[in-house]
């Protein structure tokens, strides 16, 4: 399995972001396909579970991503993307996308470095 991501993503605080992860595999996509998304915070704290897909999508039942993430992928199109809602500054960090598609061997885990930036306020825009 080979994984492709946007590598770097910038999004505005309070908005939603699509974390894009696509993959290729010599094995046909079927019920054995699994996708696991995790998060490594900027402060070096423990990795956190974000999302899981196996036949159906499954949100985490606990933690900071509970009720804030949804499946936006399409396995038939080799797409394992997710949507992260209501971005917060502490969502800054690295998101990893791991795709397993037996009998294909596991590939390198895809990474996206998310930067959550301030909303640009009208008062901050200066006209020359």
């Amino acid at each position: 399995v080979e994984i492709y991501t946007s590598r770097v993503l910038e999004a505005v605080n309070g908005t939603d972001a699509r974390l894009k992860c696509t993959f290729s595999s010599f094995a046909p996509v079927g019920d054995a396909l699994t996708v696991t998304w995790n998060f490594r915070p900027l402060d070096g704290g423990p990795e956190q579970f974000v999302f899981y897909y196996h036949i159906d999508p499954f949100q985490p039942m606990s933690g900071r991503f509970k009720d804030r993430v949804s499946w936006d992928g399409n396995p038939e199109r080799y797409d394992a993307s997710i949507l992260l809602w209501k971005l917060q500054f502490d969502d800054n960090g690295t998101y990893t996308c791991q795709v397993k598609n037996p009998p294909d061997v596991d590939g390198v885990i895809g990474e996206i470095r998310l930067s959550v930036v301030h909303t640009v306020r009208f008062s901050e825009i200066h006209f020359l």
Epitope: D43, F49, M61
Partner: antibody, heavy 116, light 106 residues
Framework: QVQLVQSGAEVKKPGASVKVSCKAS????????MHWVRQAPGQGLEWMGE????????DYNEKFQGRVTMTVDKSTSTAYMELSSLRSEDTAVYYC?????????WGQGTLVTVSS | DIQLTQSPSFLSASVGDRVTITCRAS?????MYWYQQKPGKAPKPLIY???NLASGVPSRFSGSGSGTEYTLTISSLQPEDFATYYC?????????FGQGTKLEIK
């Protein structure tokens, strides 16, 4: 490294309450939800509930609803679990644990003995 | 609440053996966790979301399954693997644990 240090063993009478503390270090306290799991002697594991340290929001196992209260003190990175109306079947080791990719980090456990 | 039933409850095996523990759920669950516990110690995570190895766990441990049936496999038992193993579901609240499988030295 992540550490969860719990308060010491307690002996309580039936009908009393117990408050167990769990002091966290080695990570950003508000970034990970704290859970409480108990284990009666020689028995399996039982999830009691969780608390979001950022806002104090809780989700309790219905079995303990009305008897359990989970709180946090962000200033000291400490979580608390109070169980009231104790009965003999509440005798157990109580663990605090944080959810990361699983319940990855656990306190050493606090033995609570309920005996008349 | 979803009930998890592990089989077997007790298992005797020798160093080098391949061992499989099964966890059956009373209704379909999306994924499974597995923990190892030694006497007097807190549980230690082995597998998260069905098949992912927790940090620092040796590759002789593996997990698989879907729906109502999940398995933990130890490909070649080592002396330090003799312990009690628990499955845990968390695709519906409250999270629940299996009753445990005690793995003993034959």
């Amino acid at each position: 490294q992540v550490q969860l240090v719990q308060s010491g063993a307690e002996v309580k009478k039936p009908g009393a309450s117990v408050k167990v503390s769990c002091k966290a270090s080695g990570y950003t306290f508000t970034n990970y939800w704290m859970h409480w799991v108990r284990q009666a002697p020689g028995q399996g594991l039982e999830w009691m509930g969780e608390i979001n340290p950022t806002n104090g929001g809780t989700d309790y196992n219905e079995k303990f609803q009305g008897r359990v209260t989970m709180t946090v003190d962000k200033s000291t990175s400490t979580a608390y679990m109070e169980l009231s109306s104790l009965r003999s079947e509440d005798t157990a080791v109580y663990y605090c644990t944080i959810y990361t990719t699983a319940l990855d980090y656990w306190g050493q456990g606090t033995l609570v003995t309920v005996s008349s | 609440d979803i009930q998890l039933t592990q089989s077997p409850s007790f298992l005797s095996a020798s160093v080098g053996d391949r061992v499989t523990i099964t966890c059956r759920a009373s209704s379909s669950v999306g994924y499974m966790y597995w923990y190892q516990q030694k006497p007097g110690k807190a549980p230690k995570p082995l597998i998260y979301v069905t098949s992912n190895l927790a940090s620092g766990v040796p590759s002789r441990f593996s997990g698989s399954g879907s729906g109502t049936e999940y398995t933990l496999t130890i490909s070649s038992l080592q002396p330090e693997d003799f312990a009690t193993y628990y499955c845990q579901q968390w695709s519906s609240n409250p999270p629940t644990f299996g009753q445990g499988t005690k793995l003993e030295i034959k």
